[in-house]
């Protein structure tokens, strides 16, 4: 039976040239995380595994930095990074657990962190 | 005694296919994550692919979508099966054992002796 | 990827000498939750598969000699072997898992 909760940092924003930091949180279990996914829509992003290390897609190697942690920095936006990112847990014995994080990158000034909320 | 053991290796033409198995035994095979990795002739090692030992399966970009790595723990055995095979994928493949500790050392301890590859027309 | 630079390619040391390899990482593969850096060293022998040496850039691996230390932190780390023996005579890589692992080009210690 799956138990674990994904608390992310919710609905967030942020500016055109900055970077912001997409934090997933797997807690509520105690299965071992074996692998964390960062995705956004269909595409991988990048790759945490517990034995291997990181690993960033070649095509968003310029602008993605692993962490902080399990976590992942992206760098220069641009308003096309405009939409959903999902952490992906692999876990065992538990299976696969999903986190979805919604980026707004604004032309202006005003970016504001939106509300972290949970998953289950 | 612990110990990883190569075999289905051999020569194969561009484009050809040919899989690869590793015998484990003297530890609880089940337990660990295991890769792949290779050493073209008079060259430096290359990861290949790792499967942990819940199933979790990884490849170096250079392999992706032409190698499948699998595991029997039930035989304690893990594969590899190669697929559109290039000049460039000759080399000497050894399986390798993730070393295991209070928190990852990340580092492959115990090594097969190795199979031989050879994609050549 | 990591690039990982081992230098020099090969050094002749007399028997009971000092031999020291150098691998420079591009990124830092040190990983600031734990303070550990993810490095590791390795021997391959002729005709033989690589044997792990030292892992997390310092720790001995059971069984290898203490003649044998690794240290460094961050991009620039160094294996040492104190006093050369024969049976030392082999290539040397570095291995970093902060990314993907990746490893250095090989380090051929002979006898002077």
């Known amino acids: 039976m799956m138990t674990g909760t994904i608390e992310t940092t919710g609905n967030i924003s942020a500016e055109k040239g900055g970077s912001i930091i997409l934090q997933c949180h797997l807690s509520s279990t105690t299965a071992q995380v074996t692998q964390v996914n960062w995705e956004q829509q269909d595409q991988l992003l990048a790759i945490c595994n517990a034995d291997l290390g990181w690993h960033i897609s070649p095509s968003f190697k310029d602008r993605v930095a692993p962490g902080p942690g399990l976590g992942l920095t992206l760098q220069s936006l641009t308003v096309n990074d405009t939409g959903e990112y999902f952490c992906i847990y692999h876990t065992y014995p538990d299976g696969t657990y999903t986190g979805r994080i919604f980026l707004e990158v604004l032309e202006s000034s005003v970016a504001e962190h939106g509300a972290r909320f949970q998953i289950p | 005694e612990v110990q990883l053991v190569e075999s289905g290796g051999g020569l194969v033409q561009p484009g050809g296919s040919l899989r690869l198995s590793c015998a484990a035994s003297?530890?609880?095979?089940?337990?660990?994550?295991m890769n792949w990795v290779r050493q073209a002739p008079g060259k430096g090692l290359e990861w290949v692919s790792y499967?942990?030992?819940?199933?979790?399966?990884n490849y170096a970009d250079s392999v992706k979508g032409r190698f499948t790595i699998s595991r029997d723990n039930a035989k304690n055995s893990l594969y590899l099966q190669m697929n559109s095979l290039r000049a460039e994928d000759t080399a000497v493949y050894y399986c390798?054992?993730?070393?295991?500790?209070?928190?990852?050392?990340?580092?492959?301890?115990?090594w097969g002796q190795g199979t031989m590859v050879t994609v050549s027309s | 990827d990591i690039v990982m630079t081992q230098s020099p390619d090969s050094l002749a040391v007399s028997l009971g000498e000092r031999a020291t390899i150098n691998c420079k990482s591009s990124?830092?593969?040190?990983?600031?939750?734990?303070?550990?850096?993810?490095l590791a060293w390795y021997q391959q022998k002729p005709g033989q598969p690589p044997k792990l040496l030292i892992y997390?850039?310092?720790t001995r691996e059971s069984g290898v000699p203490d003649r044998f230390s690794g240290s460094g932190s961050g991009t620039d780390f160094t294996l040492t072997i104190s006093s050369l023996q024969a049976e030392d005579v082999a290539v040397y890589y570095c291995?970093?898992?902060?990314?993907?692992?990746?490893f250095g080009g090989g380090t051929k210690v002979e006898i002077k």
């Open positions: 990124q830092s593969v040190l990983f600031s939750s734990n303070n550990k850096n993810y």
């Open positions: 997390w850039a310092s």
């Open positions: 291995q970093q898992s902060y990314f993907f692992p990746t």
């Open positions: 390798a054992r993730h070393r295991i500790a209070d928190s990852p050392s990340r580092a492959f301890d115990i």
């Open positions: 003297g530890f609880t095979f089940s337990s660990y994550s």
């Open positions: 499967i942990s030992s819940s199933g979790t399966i």
